[in-house]
């Protein structure tokens, strides 16, 4: 079996997680992609997904999660903005390929969000401009419910430095709504 590795991201409340998940563009460019959270002993839960088929560079926002799929580059960008301590946990990027089980991209993300608001952008940002243009139009999220039981694993032991994931649900507003963010020319 493939060894599942984790990449740890330590950020403060209010910062932005910005993850780039690479994929083979010839195989998966138009495939539907998703951002999932994995809780100990549970099935991965889909928090946000791209459209089906996935649209090139067309942002999809679900609450505080923004997905951008760049077909030309074979890259899915995932951002979680205005992070909260409750967002701490284990996440993964996947590609839906029914009837086969989802294909996991990248390392799993061990997100640790700590108190202590930072007025600056996330630790991996130095933007001189960071404006999100979000129009008021929304549509229902259409993420497949299908998840293979084989993707359920016992979560690897956490290092002592990790903050454990709270039992409460992640507080993502309007999870059932996707905000279509057009690219402004």
């Amino acid at each position: 079996a493939t060894k599942l590795t984790e990449e740890k991201y330590e950020l403060k409340e209010g910062q932005t997680l910005d993850v780039k998940c690479d994929y083979t563009l010839e195989k998966f460019a138009s495939s539907q992609k998703a951002w999932q959270i994995i809780r100990d002993g549970e099935m991965p839960k889909t928090l946000a997904c791209t459209e089906r088929p996935s649209k090139n560079s067309h942002p999809v926002q679900v609450g505080r999660i923004i997905l951008e799929d760049y077909h030309d580059h074979g890259l899915l960008r995932v951002r979680m903005v205005n992070l909260q301590v409750e967002d701490s946990g284990l996440y993964q990027c996947v590609i839906y390929q029914p009837p086969k089980e989802p294909h996991m991209l990248f390392d799993r993300i061990r997100l640790v969000v700590t108190k202590g608001f930072s007025g600056t952008p996330g630790s991996n940002e130095n933007s001189t401009q960071n404006v999100y243009k979000i129009p008021p139009t929304t549509t229902k999220a259409l993420c497949p419910l299908y998840t293979s039981p084989r993707t359920v694993t016992q979560a690897p032991p956490k290092s002592t430095a990790d903050v454990s994931t709270p039992d409460s649900e992640i507080n993502l507003t309007n999870v059932t709504d996707i905000i279509r963010v057009p690219v402004f020319n």
Epitope: E7, K8, K20, D22, Y23, N56, S57, Y70, D72, H73, G74, L75, F106, D107, S123, N124, E125, N126, S127, T128, Q129, N130, V131, Y132, K133, V183, F184, N185
Partner: antibody, heavy 116, light 107 residues
């Protein structure tokens, strides 16, 4: 076929200004992040700046912040780099590249020489 | 800033032989690593992204591996057109940074 053609390079005195331009064709310009990468003579590659499709996100390397401005005109499929307060260490070939994080396509570059 | 260090600076290899290049990051870049080839007088060309995914049209003799801080780029059997300078680049964090390059020359 993707084509990126840079222009605007040349010789300029320290403290002077130059505006580089890049004409893009062969791909959907308005759907792509674009960047500038430079290479000093005989040296390695250095990322300079990146801009999102709609200009809503812009990133610069620290050494050019406040002096260089990246911009784009999606209607004209063009990318620009306004360079002010130029220094000798800005001397390099400047490449226009497609992509905001990694760089799939490169122009042939335009040489900027900062010297008195 | 994430510092990328490539080794060796120069690698002398005979045609047909294997070439192995190394790239080390000062902190983890996950799999957000690319490799480029630059021939004399030409612009660079993307070969590998995501540490191990070959870019479109890149021959199978080029491969990449690694994750975190240690990465390897391999040319399984060097062809005459492969003698060039190779750069690694991380894109996990801004600012984006390149390694200093490895020159692969004919032995």
């Amino acid at each position: 076929e993707v084509q990126l053609v840079e222009s605007g390079g040349g010789l300029v005195q320290p403290g002077g200004s130059l505006r580089l331009s890049c004409a893009a064709s062969g791909f959907t310009f308005s759907s792509n992040w674009m960047s500038w990468v430079r290479q000093a003579p005989g040296k390695g590659l250095d990322w300079v700046a990146s801009i999102k499709q709609d200009g809503s996100e812009i990133y610069y390397v620290d050494s050019v912040k406040g002096r260089f401005t990246i911009s784009r005109d999606n209607a004209k499929n063009s990318l620009h780099l306004q360079m002010n307060s130029l220094r000798a260490e800005d001397t390099a070939v400047y490449y226009c590249v497609r992509g905001g994080w990694r760089f799939e396509s490169w122009g042939q570059g335009t040489l900027v020489t900062v010297s008195s | 800033e994430i510092v990328m260090t490539q080794s060796p600076a120069t690698l002398s290899v005979s045609p047909g032989e294997r070439a192995t290049l190394s790239c080390r990051a000062s902190q983890s870049v996950s799999s957000n690593l690319a490799w480029y080839q630059q021939k004399s007088g030409q612009a660079p060309r993307l070969l590998i992204y995501g540490a191990s995914i070959r870019a479109t049209g890149i021959p199978a003799r080029f491969s990449g591996s690694g994750s975190g801080t240690e990465f390897t780029f391999t040319i399984s059997s060097l062809q005459s057109e492969d003698f060039a300078v190779y750069y690694c680049q991380q894109y996990k964090n801004w600012p984006l940074t390149f390694g200093g390059g490895t020159k692969v020359e004919i032995k």
